[in-house]
Amino acid sequence: MAVTACQGLGFVVSLIGIAGIIAATCMDQWSTQDLYNNPVTAVFNYQGLWRSCVRESSGFTECRGYFTLLGLPAMLQAVRALMIVGIVLGAIGLLVSIFALKCIRIGSMEDSAKANMTLTSGIMFIVSGLCAIAGVSVFANMLVTNFWMSTANMYTGMGGMVQTVQTRYTFGAALFVGWVAGGLTLIGGVMMCIACRGLAPEETNYKAVSYHASGHSVAYKPGGFKASTGFGSNTKNKKIYDGGARTEDEVQSYPSKHDYV
């Protein structure tokens, strides 16, 4: 029950996180005009990954897309790439995790297969979350650098009476959405990996047991413990010989131990 809850919660948290990553990627407010020096500007500038916008005090908003690819800063391209990779991985992870959910029965899918799918989706969510956090952090770093550079250069364009003051940009709402969403996706991924531990049966490492038959004694030793990757064929732990004696390992029907997590 706890495993199902952990898996379900991990899925929901990741779903919210990925929705947030998509929202952040599409949002225009990655950077917003810093109003510290002029809180009553008649035009308010803000920029996203795909377009820059200006909102006039009348409420009229106008956006222009970045129609160039080569002319854009490499850092912006990198952030775009990280966010897209995060979305793609997250989307695939969601698709995989839907089939991995313990509460959903698909044909005769075994728990070990679900465990592997859960782990796969969990790893995908973790990488997706890290991509989003990295992308947002790179953009934030770029903003901080540009902010202090523009502050240093703020009045260097003064020639006589004429001031050409640079527009400074600060953190936009999309950055915070991205950080939170990336964090949620990461947490969801970790939860999926934890859920995976308790999902599937593991291959039992049978202890050597002595069977005292009449006349002579035979010791049966199954092959050494095989490190399970979850993709092995002997998932049922079939016993080759049952002489009536049981080891303590055999008492549990589904021991919960996964060495690959």
Partner: antibody, heavy 119, light 112 residues
């Protein structure tokens, strides 16, 4: 057609308050902002205040303490109140329309109301 | 506040000829989105002002195509290609990048 009409007193005593009403027709105040601009006799234009379609207000900081602006969307009226009038507040006061959905600014002006501050 | 300067108080012109009216601002009106928040108004004698050009070069509805605007971030020009009698009046430039919006002192266009 679009019209803006200012109404109010022609003469105000110094230190008194001025209240002017701008009544609009041909458009709705829910889609347009309204500015107040004044022009002293023989001089240039001075911007006073604007009230936007959503009720937001921007004041000229030099006059903010003396100005207040309100509106009644249903009556299509905008009200300007100016306190502590002095002789140099003598001017023609215009109300001006500003679209909320386009790049135009101050696209239609009222005929103006001439206000004299004198004892 | 941004100061708008119109150096020529008046310009005499012969009907049919072209004329340029200049205006400059104490700060660049060119925004990072590429728009220049400079507006031109004409106030005919005894009338209210009316909008001629918005965002430096865009003609307002009803404005004759004789009027055109150009400029950099701080230097602006209103050009009237063939002056007519109805063009007489005071021309004001206005910035609307920052509050308060500020107007130039005006340039009076007179017929010779």
């Amino acid at each position: 057609q679009v019209q803006l009409k200012e109404s109010g007193p022609d003469l105000v005593a110094p230190s008194q308050s001025l209240s002017i009403t701008c009544t609009v027709s041909g458009f709705s105040l829910t889609n347009y902002g309204v500015h107040w601009v004044r022009q002293p006799p023989g001089k240039g234009l001075e911007w006073l205040v604007v009230i936007w379609s959503d009720g937001r207000i921007n004041y000229n900081s030099a006059l903010k303490s003396r100005l207040s602006i309100t509106k009644d969307n249903s009556k299509r009226q905008v009200f300007l109140k100016m306190n502590s009038l002095q002789i140099d507040d003598t001017a023609i006061y215009y109300c001006v329309r500003h679209p909320a959905f386009g790049p135009h600014a101050m696209d239609y002006w009222g005929q103006g109301i001439s206000v004299t501050v004198s004892s | 506040d941004i100061v708008m300067t119109q150096d020529a108080p008046s310009i005499p012109v012969t009907p049919g000829e072209s004329v340029s009216i200049s205006c400059r601002s104490s700060k660049s009106l060119l925004n990072s989105n590429g728009n220049t928040y400079l507006y031109w108004f004409l106030q005919r004698p005894g009338q209210s002002p009316h909008l001629l050009l918005y965002r430096m070069s865009n003609p307002a509805s009803g404005a004759p195509d004789r009027f055109s605007g150009s400029g950099s971030g701080t230097e602006f020009t209103l050009r009237i290609s063939r002056v007519e009698a109805e063009d007489v009046g005071v021309y004001y430039c206005m910035q609307y990048l920052e509050y308060p919006p500020t107007f130039g002192a005006g340039t009076r266009l007179e017929l010779k």
